[in-house]
């Protein structure tokens, strides 16, 4: 659709007489008669296909035609086409004579045509005016046409259509030739398609209006690219929605088991060496000269009596020094000048005599120990305390203090590791020797069946139009993760396009 | 009196070229399209190119396409035929026409005679 | 292209004679179509435009009729200077196209 324009410019007719030579009377009261037509090879009569226009008397033999068209006036002159413009075309024009008011053709005598002229014609859309002038020797015609496409109407032939809009329905404006331009942030055929914010992830996030990144289930963060982990997770991250991956040293189903007790508590003191032996459990070898459970005990180096022959023992910045009593010589008193003649033994050891009298041994009463018999026992030497436990003298006997996990007289028994319930989901428990294992549930695995496995919510593909399925463990439900352009529970409803537009 | 008047005809060979000229008198040349025809020896008309009043508008047969081109000077009321790669079914009379039935006007030149031959 | 089939080709006719010959169009041409006079050695001459209309200075006797793809020219009372060949012509479309002719001779 478009509008086919006429501007008449000047008219000269000196004279002043019609096409039959004829002179008008007073003067040729001027107006003009136009017909647009199809291109013929031949210009030819015919009916004026393409429209038809005429004018009111513009003057008087010879005038210029003042350009109306600010005004609302006539010229130029207007022919509209609804059709595609084809480029070429066949253009009259008539002069005529108006004796009286009437200007209707059957109210004028054949005789009153003052001049007639008849082109063919090639215009584009939007061409500048194409200027033409024709004469005859009585009459010459100044003009000047051009085509232009009606509102809304865009292209070379003026026959695409296309409607500026800012609604639900598209966001743009028109180019040219007719081929929408999207105004700032939208985007897609019908610019009906938000931009987000730049960098919103494609797929986890999505926008109902430009510079806005609302992130699907599962997902959070200024761009939709960061999971959310299972709820609870405490020490754990995740890849995909609802995951809990354990970071290093954190087990169980939230990650709030605590399997490297060494690092984050750092336990063994004074130097000493940990290692983690299961949950909540380590052990520290301790440094030279510590001891204790955490290695927080300073050993004495006398501690352990090493002067014989009721040596004392004094401690030194470098070790320890026995002081020996008369008769003993030696870095432990360990060497004695005495014999049996001596009674050198004490707590009624008996002596022997050794090496031809030179030397001696005492046999000790029980209870007393020691080159002469000197010491009372120390049932502790013999370290009868298994698995770490710390031995202690109580007067003739002794006792063990065991370390966690152990018990018994002699911390020889394991304490079950099966007593604090460890297995997950009903998991049972059995001692090992070092360590337990449980047998899982279906549905469950890992080392104390934490980790859920068969029961999975995504296993029937629940999801529709090749959504993403995401399982919720904590409530053995699915989450969907909807493509562009589908929502819905399931992914299951388009956001579809109406199917016609209304423009 | 309306006159056209073709001159620039004659024997060429083969793959030659001539250039035909129309001179106008009588009426406003500039005012009108103007054709070529041509009429073989014995054979009936046919037409061969056409030029709008103001030159913008060409046309031509299929077989001279590329090888003919009309033109027009309104300043000196001529039309021209340029005629390149000519060829024995070329032999013709070509007379020049300025036709516009609209307006009755049907003014034909007497012809030129062009002989394509080795 | 639009073809042109003009009949018959040939007519013997004696003066006082009417005659008439038809042009027949490939597609529709809207009437526009015109009918030519040639002598031997001269310029075709129009006789009749959009199909019916009648050329100045041409006599009464020459008439045409006809739409969209079927055209006839009239002779109704043949007349000596009548003798020659008669040519319809096209002029909706280019390529314009010609009728192969009618040549009118004298029985």
């Known amino acids: 659709s478009g509008v086919f324009q006429l501007q008449l410019q000047e008219f000269i007719n000196e004279r002043g007489v019609l096409a039959s030579g004829r002179p008008c009377e007073p003067g040729c009261r001027t107006f003009f008669r136009v017909c647009l037509k199809h291109f013929q090879a031949v210009v030819s009569p015919g009916p004026c296909t393409f429209g038809t226009v005429s004018t009111p008397v513009l003057g008087t033999n010879s005038f210029a035609v003042r350009d109306d068209s600010s005004g609302g006036g006539r010229n130029p002159l207007q022919l509209p086409f609804n059709f595609t413009w084809p480029g070429t075309f066949s253009l009259i024009i008539e002069a005529w004579h108006a004796p009286g008011d009437d200007l209707r053709p059957e109210a004028l005598p054949p005789d009153a045509l003052i001049s007639k002229i008849a082109i063919q014609g090639s215009l584009a859309v939007g061409q500048n005016w194409l200027l033409d002038e024709q004469t005859s020797t009585l009459t010459r015609l100044r003009y000047s046409y051009r085509v232009i496409c009606s509102d809304n109407y865009y292209g070379d032939n003026c026959s695409r259509l296309c409607k500026k809009r800012n609604d639900h329905f598209g966001h743009y404006v028109c180019q040219p030739d007719g081929n929408l331009s999207c105004l700032p942030g939208w985007t897609g055929e019908y610019c009906q398609q938000p931009i987000c914010l730049s960098g919103c992830h494609e797929q986890n996030g999505y926008c109902s209006k430009p510079a806005e990144c609302l992130c699907r289930p599962g997902w959070q963060g200024r761009l939709c690219n960061e999971c959310i982990p299972h709820n609870g997770c405490r020490h754990g991250t995740c890849s995909t929605p609802w995951q809990c991956t354990c970071d290093e040293g954190w087990g169980g189903l939230f990650c709030d088991q605590d399997l490297n007790y060494c690092t984050h508590h750092s336990p063994c003191k004074n130097g000493a060496t940990c290692s983690n032996s299961g949950q909540r459990s380590y052990t520290c070898t301790c440094r030279p000269g510590y001891t204790g459970v955490d290695c927080e005990l300073e050993l004495s180096e006398c501690d352990s009596n090493p002067c014989r022959n009721g040596g004392s023992c004094k401690d030194q910045e470098d070790g320890y020094h026995c002081l020996c009593p008369p008769g003993y010589y030696g870095l432990h008193c360990e060497h004695s000048t005495l014999s049996c003649a001596d009674s050198p033994c004490f707590n009624g050891g008996s002596c022997r005599e050794r090496n031809q009298g030179a030397n001696y041994a005492c046999e000790c009463p029980p209870n007393f120990t020691g080159s002469n018999c000197e010491k009372k026992v120390d049932r502790c030497t013999s370290n009868p305390c298994a698995n770490g436990g710390q031995c202690l003298n109580r007067g003739p006997s002794r006792m063990c203090r065991c370390r966690p996990g152990f018990t018994g007289t002699y911390c020889e028994l394991h304490v079950s590791d099966c007593a604090r319930n460890p297995c997950a989901h009903g998991g049972t428990c059995h001692d090992l020797e070092n360590g337990l294992m449980c047998t899982c549930p279906a549905g469950f695995s890992g080392r104390r069946c934490e980790v859920r496995t068969s029961i999975d919510a995504c296993a029937s593909s629940p999801c529709f139009n090749r959504a993403t399925c995401y399982t919720d463990l904590s409530t053995d439900t699915f989450v969907c993760n909807c493509p562009y352009g589908f929502v819905g529970s399931r992914c299951e409803f388009p956001v579809g396009l109406p199917p016609s537009f209304p423009w | 009196e309306v006159q056209l008047v073709e001159s620039g005809g004659g024997l060429v060979q083969p793959g030659g070229s001539l250039r035909l000229s129309c001179a106008a008198s009588?009426?406003?040349?500039?005012?009108?399209?103007m054709y070529w025809i041509r009429q073989a020896p014995g054979k009936g008309l046919e037409w061969v190119a056409f030029i709008s009043h103001g030159g913008g508008i060409t046309y031509y047969r299929d077989s001279v396409k590329g090888r003919f081109t009309i033109s027009r000077d309104n300043s000196k009321s001529t039309l021209y035929l340029q005629m390149n790669s000519l060829r024995a079914e070329d032999t013709a009379v070509y007379h020049c026409?300025?036709?516009?039935?609209?307006?009755?006007?049907?003014?034909w030149g007497q012809g030129t005679m062009v002989t394509v031959s080795s | 292209d639009i073809q042109m089939t003009q009949s018959p080709s040939s007519l013997s006719a004696s003066v006082g004679d009417r005659v008439t010959i038809t042009c027949r169009a490939s597609e529709d041409i809207y009437s526009n179509l015109a009918w030519y006079q040639q002598k031997p050695g001269k310029a075709p001459k129009l006789l009749i435009y959009a199909a019916n209309r009648l050329q100045d200075g041409v006599p009464s006797r020459f008439s045409g009729s006809g739409s969209g793809t079927d055209y006839t020219l009239t002779i109704s009372s043949l007349q000596p200077e009548d003798f020659a060949t008669y040519y319809c012509?096209?002029?909706?479309?280019?390529?314009?196209?010609f009728g192969q002719g009618t040549k009118l001779e004298i029985k």
């Open positions: 026409a300025a036709l516009n039935w609209e307006l009755g006007i049907d003014y």
């Open positions: 012509l096209q002029g909706s479309k280019f390529p314009l196209t």
């Open positions: 009588g009426f406003t040349f500039s005012n009108y399209g």
